[in-house]
């Protein structure tokens, strides 16, 4: 969690002198309670916005917006504390709006915004706006909280942010997976424009289960520049286990910007559909011989193997 370094945040508006200050998340009014405290914020809204840093990087930010209630407690409102809590790490970051002049009622409702909290892809936050001074112990709460889930890098706008691009979001491998026969799987994908290696992770599962029955990892060496953006294909040899028919193929790139933390892409091949009723056993001899070498009783220790090609 951090604050955007540019431009400087502003909370002043017509009819109000105000400055934004860093906060320890422990306002003085917690320690020295006041008798008269303002009511809570109204209509707190959190939206995903995007902002550029001074260096030109694009980051997702939490755009926080709220209004004031139209009651007399506006006369006792001295500011607001904005808090963002990252749920999985308990990390909290706060800023304080410090009002330097008294608020007065006027023809329009007071409305405040803040868009300087930088957030991470695929993370959940709890955003709280506390009006200041905070209430006395056992007093009515004068804060409003909302949860905010930041989309992952698959999201169209997130894809072009600096944190997502650093993890390889612009690469679309357009994976196709084809079952050649019971023992071979062909994987095709588009290479990115970087001379870096890739890893293909094959995990096979029985029809209706989530415990894998076969795993195989295949390394693809870094392509040459003339192969960038070309299709690459790999043929993977499957372990011939009966019922081990659902295959998940995951491609892991190792781009220089994200090393082993790059976004992975996957594709799945389902088991062939089983007929609802078993086929009747014919009462005649088939007119062809079964193909030799297609026994289901292959050695279980047979390791998966593979070969690959880059297409020019």
């Amino acid at each position: 969690l951090r604050l955007l370094d540019f431009p400087a945040p502003v909370c002043a508006q017509e009819g109000l002198s105000c400055r934004v200050k860093n906060s320890t998340c422990l306002d003085d009014s917690w320690i020295h309670p006041r008798n008269l405290t303002p009511s809570s914020p109204k209509d707190l809204q959190i939206q995903l916005h995007f902002a550029h840093t001074q260096q030109g990087d694009l980051f997702p930010v939490a755009h926080i917006e709220w209004t004031l209630q139209t009651d007399a407690s506006i006369l006792y409102l001295e500011g607001a504390e904005l808090s963002v809590l990252q749920l999985n790490t308990n990390e909290r970051l706060c800023v304080r709006f410090e009002f330097l002049s008294k608020l007065r009622h006027h023809h329009r409702r007071w409305r405040f915004t803040f868009s300087h909290f930088v957030v991470d892809p695929d993370q959940e936050y709890e955003v709280t706006v506390h009006h200041l001074p905070k209430p006395i112990p056992d007093g009515d709460p004068n804060h409003q909280s909302k949860n905010f889930l930041v989309p992952d890098c698959e999201h169209a706008r997130m894809k072009v942010t600096t944190p997502c691009m650093s993890s390889g979001s612009l690469w679309d491998p357009n994976i196709t997976v084809e079952t050649l026969d019971t023992q071979h799987l062909r994987v095709d994908f588009t290479l990115w424009n970087e001379s870096t290696h890739y890893q293909i992770l094959l995990t096979s599962f029985p029809h209706m289960e989530n415990h894998s029955c076969f795993e195989h990892m295949h390394h693809i060496p870094a392509p040459r520049p003339e192969e960038f953006h070309q299709r690459s294909n790999v043929t993977l040899t499957l372990r011939n286990l009966k019922g081990c028919c659902r295959h998940q193929v995951q491609i892991q790139p190792f781009f220089s910007s994200c090393l082993n933390d790059c976004l992975r892409h996957s594709a799945t091949v389902s088991c062939p559909e089983m007929p609802d009723t078993p086929e009747p056993i014919p009462d005649y001899m088939p007119l062809w011989e079964p193909r030799s070498g297609s026994s289901d009783y292959k050695d279980d220790d047979d390791k998966g193997s593979s070969h690959h090609h880059h297409h020019h």
Partner: antibody, heavy 118, light 107 residues
Framework: EVQLVESGGGLVQPGGSLRLSCAAS????????MNWVRQAPGKGLEWVSF????????YYADSVKGRFTISRDNAKNSLYLQMNSLRDEDTAVYYC???????????WGQGTTVTVSS | DIQMTQSPSSLSASVGDRVTITCRAS??????LAWYQQKPGKFPELLIY???TLQSGVPSRFSGSGSGTDFTLTISSLQPEDVATYYC?????????FGPGTKVDIK
């Protein structure tokens, strides 16, 4: 001293219910998310459930979803786990644990034992 | 859901040996990884968070490294009091899954 103390464990029949409690002291409980983690006899750690500081976000492991309910009472500095439709495989030591600022769980209770058996 | 695997499942080493335990996530989890030590009959204790940050009070012979999918816990010089089971845990998003554990004992 920062402390978590679990209670409420015991012997229960399959299909029965139990409510675990975790009493927190020595820190501002209302500012922290909390977790339940369990450990079956001779097995590894299994994360069970998470609740955020203001109860606005709750997560469960698939193995307990629909049967267990996590809750908290910040006024009483207490965390709870209501366990219904208990199964043999729910037999474990149940720990409540506080996440550290920055990640991981830095404060754990001593655990309470739940035995599901007929 | 992201799966966590650990290797080896158990190891025996001599006092003073350098011990390395690896943890692998089935998908990238950035540095949202913690390591715990659990001694027999005791509750787990946090050793390392954010993949490489040592928890206060933990001896400096423990260190963590890695990011993304591959993580390592290293004990630079194994001591008798380090006999325990070590677990990794991901906490980028729920479910906050633990690895299956690595049991460490002295030869």
């Amino acid at each position: 001293e920062v402390q978590l103390v679990e209670s409420g464990g015991g012997l229960v029949q399959p299909g029965g219910s139990l409510r675990l409690s975790c009493a927190a002291s020595g820190f501002t409980f209302s500012s922290y998310s909390m977790n339940w983690v369990r450990q079956a006899p001779g097995k590894g750690l299994e994360w069970v459930s998470f609740i955020s500081a203001r109860s606005s976000t709750i997560y469960y492991a698939d193995s307990v979803k629909g049967r267990f309910t996590i809750s908290r009472d910040n006024a009483k500095n207490s965390l709870y786990l209501q366990m219904n439709s208990l199964r043999d495989e729910d037999t474990a030591v149940y720990y409540c644990a506080r996440p550290k600022v920055g990640g991981g769980m830095d404060v754990w209770g001593q655990g309470t034992t739940v035995t599901v058996s007929s | 859901d992201i799966q966590m695997t650990q290797s080896p499942s158990s190891l025996s080493a001599s006092v003073g040996d350098r011990v390395t335990i690896t943890c692998r996530a089935s998908q990238g989890i950035s540095n949202y990884l913690a390591w715990y030590q659990q001694k027999p009959g005791k509750f787990p204790e946090l050793l390392i968070y954010a993949a490489s940050t040592l928890q206060s009070g933990v001896p400096s012979r423990f260190s963590g490294s890695g990011s993304g999918t591959d993580f390592t816990l290293t004990i630079s010089s194994l001591q008798p009091e380090d006999v325990a089971t070590y677990y990794c845990q991901k906490y980028n998003r729920a479910p906050f899954t633990f690895g299956p554990g690595t049991k460490v004992d002295i030869k």
